[in-house]
C-alpha cells in the first residue's frame, strides 16, 4: 500500500525557520503535491504550496520556498514572522496525487521534544486508515 511520510524540522541557526519534508512511498508517478497547514486542504487547513512536476510550483505566505527533492519527495521552507513560533504546534499535511492510482495524504508536526536542528523521524502519520 502506498504511503506518505511527513517530517517537520526547525532550523538550528534560525529558530523562526522551519522546513517540511514530504515523500511518497509507492508505485506510480506523482502528478501533484499539495501542502497545507492546520489540517488537510478542504478540511479546515490552509494551502501553503502546490507542486507540479512539469508546470512548476505555487506557494503562499508564510511558505518561502517549495521544491522537489526527488521525483517522489518535496520540501517546503517556512518563515515564521511571529516571535512566538506558532509553527511548533502546527500540523502540516501533504497530499500526493498519482494518476491513475489516486491520492494519498498524511500529516505531521514538530515533535514536542525536538531540539533545534534535529529533524523529526520520517514516521508517517496517516490521517486516513492505511487500508483506504
Amino acid at each position: 500500500t502506498p504511503e506518505v511520510w511527513v517530517q517537520v524540522q526547525m532550523e538550528a541557526t534560525e529558530l523562526s525557520s522551519f522546513t517540511v519534508h514530504c515523500g511518497f512511498l509507492g508505485p506510480g508517478s506523482i502528478s501533484l503535491v499539495t501542502v497545507s497547514w492546520g489540517g488537510p486542504d478542504g478540511a479546515g487547513g490552509t494551502k501553503l504550496a502546490v507542486l507540479h512536476p512539469e508546470l512548476g510550483t505555487r506557494q503562499w505566505a508564510p511558505a518561502r520556498q517549495a521544491r522537489w527533492e526527488t521525483q517522489s519527495s518535496i520540501s517546503l521552507a517556512l518563515e515564521d514572522s511571529g516571535a512566538s513560533s506558532p509553527f511548533a504546534n502546527t500540523t502540516f499535511c501533504c497530499k500526493f496525487a498519482s494518476f491513475p492510482e489516486g491520492s494519498w495524504e498524511s500529516c505531521g508536526s514538530l515533535p514536542p521534544s525536538s531540539d533545534p536542528g534535529l529533524s523529526a523521524p520520517p514516521t508517517p502519520v496517516p490521517i486516513l486508515r492505511a487500508d483506504l
Epitope: S29, L32, L55, P100, G102
Partner: antibody
Framework: DVKLVESGGGLVKLGGSLKLSCAAS????????MSWIRQTPEKRLELVAA????????YYLDTVKGRFTISRDNAKNTLYLQMSSLKSEDTALYYC?????????????WGQGTSVTVSS | SIVMTQTPKFLLVSAGDRVTITCKAS??????VAWYQEKPGQSPKLLMY???HRFTGVPDRFTGSGYGTDFTFTINTVQAEDLAVYFC?????????FGGGTKLEIK
C-alpha cells in the same frame, strides 16, 4: 478552444471488436491524462479506462480487463480504445475526457460521445 | 471500490426554488469530489471540482460543500436551463466512481 471528437462506434456482433478514436485539439495533448467513460442505457456513468500523459500508466475497469486496451499517440493528438470480445453489457455511449491535475483529476472537458451497440 | 450513493434520484421543482443533492462515499475521499451536469442531448460538463470550486463560467448559484464522506451540491434559485441530470464523482482512489445521478425537472 478545447475539442474532443470521438469516432469508431457502431453496431457490432457479440464477441466482435471495435476501435474507438478520440481526436484532441485546442490544448497540449501530451500534457494531459485522458480516459474513456461510458454511459450505459440505464444512464449510469463508468470510467472504463484511463491513461496518463506519457502513456505509461493505465487503468481498466475490472469488467473490461483483458478485453479493452487504452492507448494514445501524442504525435497525432489521438486517444484510442481497442475493444474486443465484446459483450452485451458493453453497449453504451462512450466518451473520451481530459483530466486536469490542478482540479483533483476532475474531467474538465468531454467529447460528444460515440455509440457502441453489441447485438446477438 | 468506493461507492458513491447519490440522493435523491429525481427532483421536481419550480423555477426559483433551492435544490440540494447529496452524495455519500462508502469511505473517505478527502476533497476529491467533482460534480457534473448532463443536459438532454449533451455530454456531461464539469461544474465543481475539489468539492466547492466552480469551473470556468459556472454561475455562482451552484455551490458545493463537504469533506471525507458527506458531500452536498446546491442550486440556489433554480432556473429553467438547469434541467439536467447531475452526477457526483470521486477521483480520490481508483477505481474512480460516480454517483447514480439526480434528474432535475422543472415544473
Amino acid at each position: 478552444d478545447v475539442k474532443l471528437v470521438e469516432s469508431g462506434g457502431g453496431l457490432v456482433k457479440l464477441g466482435g471488436s471495435l476501435k474507438l478514436s478520440c481526436a484532441a485539439s485546442g490544448f497540449t495533448f501530451s500534457s494531459y491524462h485522458m480516459s474513456w467513460i461510458r454511459q450505459t442505457p440505464e444512464k449510469r456513468l463508468e470510467l472504463v479506462a484511463a491513461i496518463n500523459s506519457n502513456g505509461i500508466n493505465t487503468y481498466y475497469l475490472d469488467t473490461v480487463k483483458g478485453r479493452f486496451t487504452i492507448s494514445r499517440d501524442n504525435a497525432k493528438n489521438t486517444l484510442y480504445l481497442q475493444m474486443s470480445s465484446l459483450k452485451s453489457e458493453d453497449t453504451a455511449l462512450y466518451y473520451c475526457a481530459r483530466h486536469e491535475d490542478y482540479y483533483g483529476f476532475a474531467m474538465d472537458y468531454w467529447g460528444q460521445g460515440t455509440s457502441v451497440t453489441v447485438s446477438s | 471500490s468506493i461507492v458513491m450513493t447519490q440522493t435523491p434520484k429525481f427532483l421536481l421543482v419550480s423555477a426559483g426554488d433551492r435544490v440540494t443533492i447529496t452524495c455519500k462515499a462508502s469511505q473517505s475521499v478527502s476533497n476529491d469530489v467533482a460534480w457534473y451536469q448532463e443536459k438532454p442531448g449533451q455530454s456531461p460538463k464539469l461544474l465543481m471540482y475539489y468539492v466547492s470550486h466552480r469551473f470556468t463560467g459556472v454561475p455562482d448559484r451552484f455551490t458545493g460543500s463537504g469533506y471525507g464522506t458527506d458531500f452536498t451540491f446546491t442550486i440556489n434559485t433554480v432556473q429553467a436551463e438547469d434541467l439536467a441530470v447531475y452526477f457526483c464523482h470521486q477521483a480520490y482512489r481508483s477505481p474512480w466512481t460516480f454517483g447514480g445521478g439526480t434528474k432535475l425537472e422543472i415544473k
